[in-house]
Interface confidence: low
């Protein structure tokens, strides 16, 4: 439905508060280095303009597209060239090329200072002094650090952030009330950002078809009682929502997401029995709840898949008539029967089925050719099952920290060219799969583990894409979205790698390590571990364990010493010498 003024349409649909918040997110995700005050000024100008268009849709410039309006506004930033370099060249382009140019310059790892949490009293004072600015600053800081964060979901996080401060700043023990809530929001926020980053990568690198296939599989698992036509409609709508958000069209995305939630709740009888509670919530909570809703029960009387997809004489006829819909129906039917499979496994099975039909439907006897296609699925199913079993056993034996260390060593040996901070971040996250998924019963382990690993490996892929250093990473990241994890799993030690020169400075530590949190201290030790492996890629597990145990003892000893700095200097030299001897450096 065409509107005379798109900006007026979205302002009216979303309301002023959400409109301003979403424009701020959009601007912060594009111009990640701009100061907060500059963004607020731009947002206020856009909002005032939108109000004039609401009053009179025929007013000057009100008929312009949102990309034109927002792009023009971003290009008024005076310091664009000094701050962003070649990104300023985007402003010489016309829409839609200009927006594409801005999108290409989004930085997954912007050079921004770590967010340091002030004292609770300081935060509460700031919250009470100016609640609106305080919450805007939250949106701004998250959006600029996570340029693909799912904007309507960030509004939900901001609502929870506000609720936490409203409740806790008047509590007797503010810190005890607030800090766990902020920790939870931080962890959930990072997870949400990473999940959305995978959706955007899927759309941008592998296309709409890949995203739709993912969505068919996931929604069919979640809504196994819904008809294929219903799932198809939801997939089409969901694809539109995510295409918009990943493309920077945040107002349209938020509006369409609200419409989708409304449709789902109006039609929950034919979608899922699990939606009732979600649909009673206010909009932001409702959309979040629907996105996280548990799988509905599978219909009891589902017939065998073989009848329609193997035994039927019409398989090739049906496939030829409408390939993607027939494959979509296969994926729908398989996924609704298998909530115990990961989405990526289901997509591998569908790909195998497609490849078999492509080959067999051109053969002399198609049915004879594809009759055993389901047998080809067995090894594909067993591979992740075995991998998860082995790794969960290792996790249970080692605990999270040491399991992370095992993965650090494993991945550093596979791709030693990758930067140490990236290897530490990715391996730590890979290691979290243990505590996240191994506690689940068998039937829930694979969807939890393998789909989580897809999200984490995508972090590696997007960080590596910014500064490519390893052909092996590029290959695993670009060849197949659904085979990324098996591709990385299959990598052996990189025999072509020339070990890094030994640098004592890398292994020099100071007393400041003693005041770090347990997490930060772990990161320091894990950074040292990666560097050790880069120096000595052929070091055995036993050698590395011995050095790391010595290192842990060294840190503990010096942190208890009266003269910590001297201890670190003197004992550190001894440790380096002992480590060199132990590893033959």
């Amino acid at each position: 439905d065409a509107h005379k003024s798109e900006v007026a349409h979205r302002f009216k649909d979303l309301g002023e508060e959400n409109f301003k918040a979403l424009v701020l997110i959009a601007f912060a995700q594009y111009l990640q280095q701009c100061p907060f005050e500059d963004h607020v000024k731009l947002v206020n100008e856009v909002t005032e303009f939108a109000k004039t268009c609401v009053a009179d849709e025929s007013a000057e410039n009100c008929d312009k597209s949102l990309h034109t309006l927002f792009g023009d506004k971003l290009c008024t930033v005076a310091t664009l060239r000094e701050t962003y370099g070649e990104m300023a060249d985007c402003c010489a382009k016309q829409e839609p090329e200009r927006n594409e140019c801005f999108l290409q310059h989004k930085d997954d790892n912007p050079n921004l200072p770590r967010l340091v949490r002030p004292e609770v009293d300081v935060m509460c004072t700031a919250f009470h002094d100016n609640e609106e600015t305080f919450l805007k600053k939250y949106l701004y800081e998250i959006a600029r650090r996570h340029p693909y964060f799912y904007a309507p979901e960030l509004l939900f996080f901001a609502k929870r952030y506000k609720a936490a401060f409203t409740e806790c700043c008047q509590a007797a023990d503010k810190a005890a009330c607030l800090l766990p809530k902020l920790d939870e929001l931080r962890d959930e926020g990072k997870a949400s950002s990473a999940k959305q980053r995978l959706k955007c990568a899927s759309l941008q690198k592998f296309g709409e078809r890949a995203f739709k296939a993912w969505a068919v599989a996931r929604l069919s698992q979640r809504f196994p009682k819904a008809e294929f036509a219903e799932v198809s409609k939801l997939v089409t709508d969901l694809t539109k929502v995510h295409t918009e958000c990943c493309h920077g069209d945040l107002l349209e995305c938020a509006d369409d997401r609200a419409d989708l939630a409304k449709y789902i709740c109006e039609n929950q009888d034919s979608i899922s029995s699990k939606l009732k509670e979600c649909c009673e919530k206010p909009l932001l909570e409702k959309s979040h709840c629907i996105a996280e809703v548990e799988n509905d029960e599978m219909p009891a009387d589902l017939p065998s898949l073989a009848a329609d997809f193997v035994e039927s004489k019409d398989v090739c006829k049906n496939y030829a008539e409408a390939k993607d819909v027939f494959l979509g129906m296969f994926l729908y039917e398989y996924a609704r029967r298998h909530p115990d499979y990961s989405v990526v496994l289901l997509l591998r099975l569908a790909k195998t089925y497609e490849t078999t039909l492509e080959k067999c439907c051109a053969a002399a006897d198609p049915h004879e050719c594809y009759a055993k296609v389901f047998d080809e699925f067995k090894p594909l199913v067993e591979e992740p099952q075995n991998l998860i079993k082995q790794n969960c056993e290792l996790f249970e034996q080692l605990g999270e920290y040491k399991f992370q260390n095992a993965l650090l060593v494993r991945y550093t040996k596979k791709v030693p060219q990758v930067s140490t901070p990236t290897l530490v971040e990715v391996s730590r996250n890979l290691g979290k799969v243990g505590s996240k998924c191994c506690k689940h019963p068998e039937a829930k382990r694979m969807p939890c583990a393998e789909d989580y690993l897809s999200v984490v490996l995508n972090q590696l892929c997007v960080l590596h894409e910014k500064t490519p250093v390893s052909d092996r990473v590029t290959k695993c990241c670009t060849e197949s979205l659904v085979n990324r994890r098996p591709c990385f799993s299959a990598l052996e030690v990189d025999e072509t790698y020339v070990p890094k020169e030994f640098n004592a400075e890398t292994f020099t530590f100071h007393a400041d390590i003693c005041t770090l949190s347990e997490k930060e201290r772990q990161i320091k030790k894990q950074t040292a571990l990666v560097e050790l492996v880069k120096h000595k890629p052929k070091a055995t597990k036993e050698q590395l364990k011995a050095v790391m145990d010595d290192f842990a003892a060294f840190v503990e000893k010096c942190c208890k010493a009266d003269d910590k700095e001297t201890c670190f200097a003197e004992e550190g030299k001894k440790l380096v010498a002992a480590s060199q001897a132990a590893l033959g450096l």
Epitope: A226, E227, A229, E230, S270, N318, E321
Partner: nanobody, 115 residues
Framework: EVQLLESGGGLVQPGGSLRLSCAAS????????MSWVRQAPGKGPEWVSA????????RYAETVKGRFTISRDNSKNTLYLQMNSLRPEDTAVYYC????????GSQGTLVTVSS
């Protein structure tokens, strides 16, 4: 993309007749059973009738048996519902779906039976 487009609805007097059509595209129409479903104002969806992929096997809800006839033309990718002896309680939005379900994958066509 699966698309189902209904037409043929309208205002009709009690006892009158209407023929609804559903044009299907984006999937192998001849391979799937189809249904008609209706939703009266303020009520939930109600399954009306179903037909198998070849058109040989047809089923009807008790409320419409003997008055409605479902049929299909696979060469035209079209599903039909012939509605005779219409009653005020037949007033609803009618829509077609793939398989035998009450899920809405389309906009539907409004049938109003009133004198």
């Amino acid at each position: 993309e699966v698309q189902l487009l209904e037409s043929g609805g309208g205002l009709v007097q009690p006892g009158g007749s209407l023929r609804l059509s559903c044009a299907a595209s984006g999937f192998s129409f001849g391979s799937f059973g189809m249904s008609w479903v209706r939703q009266a104002p303020g009520k939930g969806p109600e399954w009306v009738s179903a037909i198998d992929s070849g058109g040989a096997d047809t089923r009807y809800a008790e409320t419409v048996k003997g008055r409605f006839t479902i049929s299909r033309d696979n060469s035209k990718n079209t599903l039909y519902l012939q509605m005779n002896s219409l009653r005020p309680e037949d007033t609803a939005v009618y829509y077609c779906t793939i398989g035998r379900s009450t899920s809405r994958g389309s906009q539907g066509t409004l049938v109003t039976v009133s004198s």
